[in-house]
């Protein structure tokens, strides 16, 4: 069985000196110096900054919520699948 843990919204502290939102915005087509669209990879925080976020599980990006969640391996739970069930 796979346990999907709570959704984590990448933090958003939009001050002038720091803005820690990790959420990617939907890209418009085309663009200066753009690669061929076929070769572009959708910007997904799970591939980038959240690549080590889920400890015993798989990171999933929920685009419409602009948030990441962890799909935990069997016997693990918690926001980052870091806790082991005592069964």
């Amino acid at each position: 069985s796979v346990r999907v843990e709570q959704v984590v919204k990448p933090p958003q502290n939009k001050t002038e000196s720091e803005n820690t939102s990790d959420k990617p915005k939907r890209k418009k087509k085309g663009g200066k110096n753009g690669k061929n669209r076929r070769n572009r990879k959708k910007k997904n925080p799970c591939n980038a900054e959240f690549q080590n976020f889920c400890i015993h599980g798989e990171c999933k990006y929920i685009e419409h919520l602009e948030a990441v969640t962890c799909k935990c391996q069997q016997e693990y739970f918690g926001e980052r699948c870091g806790e082991k069930s005592m069964k």
């Epitope: 984590v8 803005n19 959420k23 591939n47 080590n52």
Partner: antibody, heavy 120, light 108 residues
Framework: EVQLQQSGAELVKPGASVKLSCTAS????????MHWVKQRPEQGLEWIGR????????KYDPKFQGKATITADTSSNTADLHLSSLTSEDTAVYYC?????????????WGAGTTVTVSS | QIVLTQSPAILSASPGEKVTMTCRAG?????IHWYQQKPGSSPKPWIY???NLASGVPARFSGSGSGTSYSLTISRVEAEDAATYYC???????????FGAGTKLELK
Amino acid sequence: EVQLQQSGAELVKPGASVKLSCTASGFNIKDTYMHWVKQRPEQGLEWIGRIDPANRSTKYDPKFQGKATITADTSSNTADLHLSSLTSEDTAVYYCARLYGDSVWYFDVWGAGTTVTVSS
Amino acid sequence: QIVLTQSPAILSASPGEKVTMTCRAGSSVNYIHWYQQKPGSSPKPWIYATSNLASGVPARFSGSGSGTSYSLTISRVEAEDAATYYCQQWSGYPPMLTFGAGTKLELK
């Protein structure tokens, strides 16, 4: 060809500010995260922070908070690093790097670096 | 923020020798990336996602590891491999990027 072209060396006085530029060619910076890395003479690599040019969101290592400001201009495909209140500790080579890749992203392209020397 | 500890700091090897350098994370991570840097040059991507060789990297290099322990191995060292190798990872929430202090490979 995918490249990052960095601005030239800077000699600045203590207390001053400086702006370093990194211009991308061969790709659109909106599709990546642009990072800045510091390397002091004979030392290792230190992550300063990054910008997501698509929404201009930034993230910094806490030790560079207030010292560094990263901005991006998607029309010129450029990411800039602003350093303020410079001291001798800021004398270093500053690299811009692109975070990109396949399923797991890493720094696949680096600029040649900009040397900043802080001296009176 | 998870600290990355690289060892040894300096590695001295003869051409043809097999060498291994390690990178230890303060707590479990999924992926480590390695970069090679030669004096006066910018770092180059070398091994990504623990075990994948970046473009142009010779097959004598390999990467492995999991959890908190990762390594870069050169099966037969060549003169051109003399450089400093840095490991890198993302950790924590919000995620922060960290580099190891580097392992300098010197040839005898």
